[in-house]
Interface confidence: medium
């Protein structure tokens, strides 16, 4: 649902769900490609594996990934790239059971950060070919402009 | 980053990251000392192991701690002390694997609470000498005035 | 605490804690009955096992459940029922240790969603007779109107 702003005082929001997840052959990471499920305001733009910040400011960011993987620890890193540098904002880490039938954990984290115009926000799983569940209610990413 | 308020309608926010963590000898707790990473508004003040509320109101509070400990369960308790009593607001609990290489879990929780002027907010890990990872993107504490 | 609104610009909020949790005999689910711990505004109404949305809009929803259960995976599903259909908004999943003394995990998740007038929000644990800890700082549910 894309909502129009009735008044300036409303918060811009963006809630994204996965399209797919891929690993580059030469990289020990898995990236998620996102699509909007809910958008209010125009300050944020989904762009493939990232989200572009068009309206600088202070945002509440949240991220959840649902893992189905027996790798001993799994998790995601939320980072921003802009002004020529990359910065990790927050990460979530979950120890996983070694038995495949039990290896099922969601990992949620969130925080408030100042984002700059032109920043690209992304969610990275620092594992090649990570086994994720891309259900929209298990894996998602969100922004609220404060 | 310390931000100035362009207009009164903006939310006061404070995002804190660790300086260090210590345990008192006579108590089975570990406390975290905090420093601001992002601040907007003046209603919240980091004070060593606590955060003083200078502007009463309803706040979204969030807390994450990154544990590297084989103690069977780990977690943090977020509480407020004020008006002569202490109150637990919320807690996060995580069972930990017994193998040190796997014992790596972040624990995130959050909620909305009414805080009073003069309240001191703190994050307690009810374990002495808890093994924490004090990376600013793994362990943090935050407030948003609603 | 029920707070009055000093001005229209304040966010409506509702933070709920458990009264009890029950399983219907013929159903493989456990439901939680909620009571308000903090309320500001009139747009949300606790109704037994659900929360009725009286004021449509975009909300930050959060949910935590504290599990004390050796069932291999535990978790909660937050869903809305309205306009003749049910929709899962988000879920939290946690693998549990098989030893009862270690089987202790909180599961937190949250997200931003558009809720319609008349929607009923509920938290379901898709396990019959799930062993939950109903401490108000371990299991809770919350809403912030954005």
């Amino acid at each position: 649902a894309v909502l129009t702003q009735k008044q300036k005082k409303q918060h811009s929001v963006l809630h994204l769900v996965p399209i797919n997840a891929t690993s580059k052959d030469d990289s020990d990471v898995t990236e998620v490609m996102w699509q909007p499920a809910l958008r209010r305001g125009r300050g944020l733009q989904a762009q493939g594996y990232g989200v572009r910040i068009q309206d600088a400011g202070v945002y509440l960011l949240y991220s959840q990934v649902l893992f189905q993987d027996v790798t001993f620890t799994m998790g995601q890193v939320v980072s921003r790239e802009g002004q020529g540098r990359q910065e990790t904002l927050f990460r979530c880490i979950r120890s996983m059971p070694s038995h495949p039938d039990r290896a099922y954990n969601s990992c949620y984290s969130a925080g408030v950060f100042h984002l700059h115009q032109g920043d690209i926000l992304s969610v990275i799983i620092p594992r090649a070919r990570a086994k994720l569940n891309l259900s929209p209610h298990g894996t998602f990413l969100g922004f609220v402009k404060l | 980053a310390v931000l100035t308020q362009k207009q009164k309608k903006q939310h006061s926010v404070l995002h804190l990251v660790p300086i260090n963590a210590t345990s008192k000898d006579d108590s089975d707790v570990t406390e975290v000392m905090w420093q601001p990473a992002l601040r907007r508004g003046r209603g919240l003040q980091a004070q060593g192991y606590g955060v003083r509320i200078q502007d009463a109101g309803v706040y979204l509070l969030y807390s994450q701690v990154l544990f590297q400990d084989v103690t069977f369960t780990m977690g943090q308790v977020v509480s407020r002390e004020g008006q002569g009593r202490q109150e637990t607001l919320f807690r996060c609990i995580r069972s930990m694997p017994s193998h040190p290489d796997r014992a790596y879990n972040s624990c995130y929780s959050a909620g909305v609470f009414h805080l009073h002027q003069g309240d001191i907010l703190s994050v307690i890990i009810p374990r002495a000498r808890a093994k924490l990872n004090l990376s600013p993107h793994g362990t943090f504490l935050g407030f948003v005035k609603l | 605490a029920v707070l009055t609104q000093k001005q229209k610009k304040q966010h409506s909020v509702l933070h709920l804690v458990p009264i009890n949790a029950t399983s219907k005999d013929d159903s493989d689910v456990t439901e939680v009955m909620w009571q308000p711990a903090l309320r500001r505004g009139r747009g949300l109404q606790a109704q037994g096992y659900g929360v009725r949305i009286q004021d449509a809009g975009v909300y930050l929803l959060y949910s935590q459940v504290l599990f004390q259960d050796v069932t291999f995976t535990m978790g909660q599903v937050v869903s809305r029922e309205g306009q003749g259909r049910q929709e899962t908004l988000f879920r939290c999943i946690r693998s549990m240790p098989s030893h009862p003394d270690r089987a202790y995990n909180s599961c937190y998740s949250a997200g931003v969603f558009h809720l319609h007038q008349g929607d009923i929000l509920s938290v379901i644990i898709p396990r019959a007779r799930a062993k939950l800890n109903l401490s108000p700082h371990g299991t809770f549910l919350g809403f912030v109107k954005l």
Partner: antibody, heavy 121, light 107 residues
């Protein structure tokens, strides 16, 4: 099977100290906290605190802070509770009790047989 | 400190009776309440934890219920071995506190 065996009865004078021991067997000593609870004659139960054998860290009831010391010796799976500056109203049966795990949110599932401490001049 | 108020203080009943003991907490303690049975000269024995979970080996005639501030221990059909003193305890907030006890005696 889990057993907690406490030391024998003690008679002490006011102002003295008493140290009660509690030997655990049948489980991994460092995986559970050990609570201490006392019961004055004909009265109810009063929680004094606990020792976490995993990290040798105590948690005391504020009422007893400064007078109580809880310790442990993991090599012999034994917990100790020492109460100083004894008064006549400290006359009670002192119990050790195993905490079911993480101290908060867990009940006390196994109890020692109790140690009678009598404070009399 | 949280006050746990038990009632009644004394209860007279007969074998086969159904009896109920209540415990009220001075503030919300979730379901972090235990019930113990104590016989004269003996240590307390855990019956119920988490308000309603029977400990292993405890007969099914013992049941617990409640959450928040009001809790109940019910013995569905009294047996001769059940005449004892019963204590509730909250373990939600330090310091842990006990009720003053209910003495169950033969009528």
């Amino acid at each position: 099977q889990v057993q907690l065996v406490q030391s024998g009865a003690e008679v002490k004078k006011p102002g003295a100290s008493v140290k009660v021991s509690c030997k655990a067997s049948g489980y991994t000593f460092t995986s559970y906290v050990m609570h201490w609870v006392r019961q004055a004659p004909g009265q109810g139960l009063e929680w004094m605190g606990y020792i976490n054998p995993y990290n040798d860290a105590p948690k005391y009831n504020e009422k007893f802070k400064g007078r109580v010391t809880m310790t442990r010796d993991t090599s012999i799976s034994t917990a100790y509770m020492e109460l100083s500056r004894l008064r006549s109203d400290d006359t009670a049966v002192y119990y050790c009790a195993r905490g079911l795990g993480y101290a908060l949110y867990y009940a006390m599932d196994y109890w020692g047989q109790g140690t009678t401490v009598t404070v009399s001049s | 400190d949280i006050v746990m108020t038990q009632s009644p203080s004394t209860l007279s009943a007969s074998v086969g009776d159904r009896v109920t003991i209540t415990c009220k907490a001075s503030q919300n303690v979730g379901n972090n309440v235990a019930w113990y049975q104590q016989k004269p000269g003996k240590a307390p024995k855990l019956l119920i934890s988490s308000a309603s979970n029977r400990d292993s080996g405890v007969p099914s005639r013992f049941s617990g219920s409640g959450s928040g501030t009001e809790f109940t221990l019910t013995i569905s059909s009294l047996q001769p071995d059940d005449f004892a003193t019963y204590f509730c305890q909250q373990y939600n907030i330090y310091p842990f506190t006990f009720g003053q006890g209910t003495k169950l005696e033969i009528k």
